[in-house]
């Protein structure tokens, strides 16, 4: 299910130098022929193209990954960068362009023979219920969802949340992923501030349920940044 935990980041409130005038969410942008959408006939406007700030790969387009624009750059400023083509260096699957994955530090073709059941770590979902394909690309998952005929119950191994029964999400548990309950009002939740924080979670929490968002608990506002407790609260 869709995460209704919403970071209310307005586009214009970006760290410099990324948030220029074109970053205003309401700004008028003229349509110009651009990049053809996968599975659609819409064209993305690319005049005045500005890099998109991100915290994780899934915030970027299908042909992008999230990273610092300079080697050894400030980890706090990351943008969506163009994916790496075949035979280019990589550190993780999402860096490689659709149809490829990262093997031994090099992007290689993701032809089915290569996979032999490898599971890519970054899984994304669509708004629709049919999750077997992602924009027609196999970049985000390397196991066919056809393997999952029944919806997983709590504790079942999963690839993505659509593999889990209603009210459950697919979250990391040690070094695999299992179906866990979606968080209810008042339950502690995780608010990710930096990309690196995802990788540290060996016990990942689900997101907050419908109508709830992950916010600082009111009586914790005065606490230090490191000890702030976030809970699922009504919008």
């Amino acid at each position: 299910t869709l995460n209704s935990v919403l970071n209310s980041n307005a586009i214009k409130n970006l760290p410099p130098p990324l948030g220029g005038a074109a970053g205003h969410p309401g700004s008028a942008v003229s349509a110009a022929p651009g990049i053809l959408y996968p599975g659609g006939n819409k064209y993305q406007t690319i005049d005045n193209y500005q890099p998109y700030p991100c915290a994780e790969d899934e915030e970027c387009g299908t042909d992008e990954y999230c990273a610092s624009p300079t080697r050894g750059g400030d980890a706090g400023v990351q943008i969506c960068l163009a994916c790496r083509k075949r035979r280019k260096r990589c550190m993780r699957h999402a860096m490689c362009c659709p149809g490829n994955y990262c093997k031994n530090g090099i992007c290689v073709s993701s032809d089915q023979n290569h996979f032999r059941g490898e599971i890519e770590e970054t899984i994304t979902e669509s708004f629709g219920n049919d999750h077997s394909t992602l924009d027609g690309y196999s970049r985000r998952t390397t196991l066919s969802s056809k393997m999952y005929h029944t919806k997983g119950q709590e504790g079942s191994v999963c690839l993505r949340s659509s593999d889990c029964a209603s009210g459950l999400c697919c979250a990391r548990h040690f070094w695999s992923k299992i179906c866990k309950p979606v968080l209810k009002e008042g339950q502690v939740c995780t608010k990710h501030r930096r990309k690196g924080s995802h990788g540290l979670e060996i016990f990942q929490r689900c997101y907050c349920g419908e109508g709830l968002s992950c916010r600082i608990q009111k009586d914790h506002h005065q606490a230090s940044n490191s000890s702030r407790l976030h809970t699922c609260q009504r919008h």
């Epitope: 869709l2 995460n3 935990v5 919403l6 970071n7 209310s8 980041n9 586009i11 970006l14 990324l18 948030g19 074109a22 970053g23 205003h24 969410p25 309401g26 700004s27 942008v29 349509a31 990049i35 053809l36 959408y37 996968p38 599975g39 659609g40 819409k42 064209y43 993305q44 406007t45 690319i46 193209y49 500005q50 890099p51 998109y52 700030p53 915290a55 994780e56 899934e58 915030e59 970027c60 387009g61 299908t62 042909d63 992008e64 969506c80 163009a82 994304t124 979902e125 669509s126 708004f127 629709g128 219920n129 049919d130 999750h131 077997s132 394909t133 924009d135 027609g136 990710h192 997101y207």
Partner: nanobody
């Protein structure tokens, strides 16, 4: 093709609240962005809010920030726009919009109307 049907519009007094819903059907598996735009009489269609495919970002026009909240429920293929503290200038036809995940994304992506497919719209009138 994606079909989008809005509901929840109506007449409300200034300071009041409304919750718009947008039900998506058809080819919903490719949807990655759900948004709301609005068009007041005699004006151009303007961006209101959007929720990204990554589920971690919501984007709002300055004029509605702090008053409107966009959310979505994947299990129902539905997007919502909770509108609080409504003002007369919020009067407009509100359109639900949906788009697939692009190959490349830029800061202007979410507010660019040409990227989206559209519903028929629902009228919101704020008047005393």
């Amino acid at each position: 093709e994606v079909q989008l049907v809005e509901s929840g519009g109506g007449l409300v007094q200034p300071g009041g609240s409304l919750r718009l819903s947008c039900a998506a059907s058809g080819s919903t598996s490719s949807l990655r962005t759900m948004g709301w735009f609005r068009q007041a009489p005699g004006k151009e269609r303007e961006f209101v809010a959007a929720i990204s495919w990554s589920l971690s970002r919501t984007h709002y026009a300055d004029s509605v920030k702090g008053r409107f909240t966009i959310s979505a429920d994947n299990s129902k293929n539905t997007a919502y726009l909770q509108m609080n503290s409504l003002k007369p200038e919020d009067t407009a036809v509100y359109y639900c919009a949906a788009a697939p995940r692009p190959k490349r994304v830029s800061v202007s992506y979410f507010s660019t109307a040409s990227n989206y497919d559209w519903g028929q719209g629902t009228l919101v009138t704020v008047s005393s």
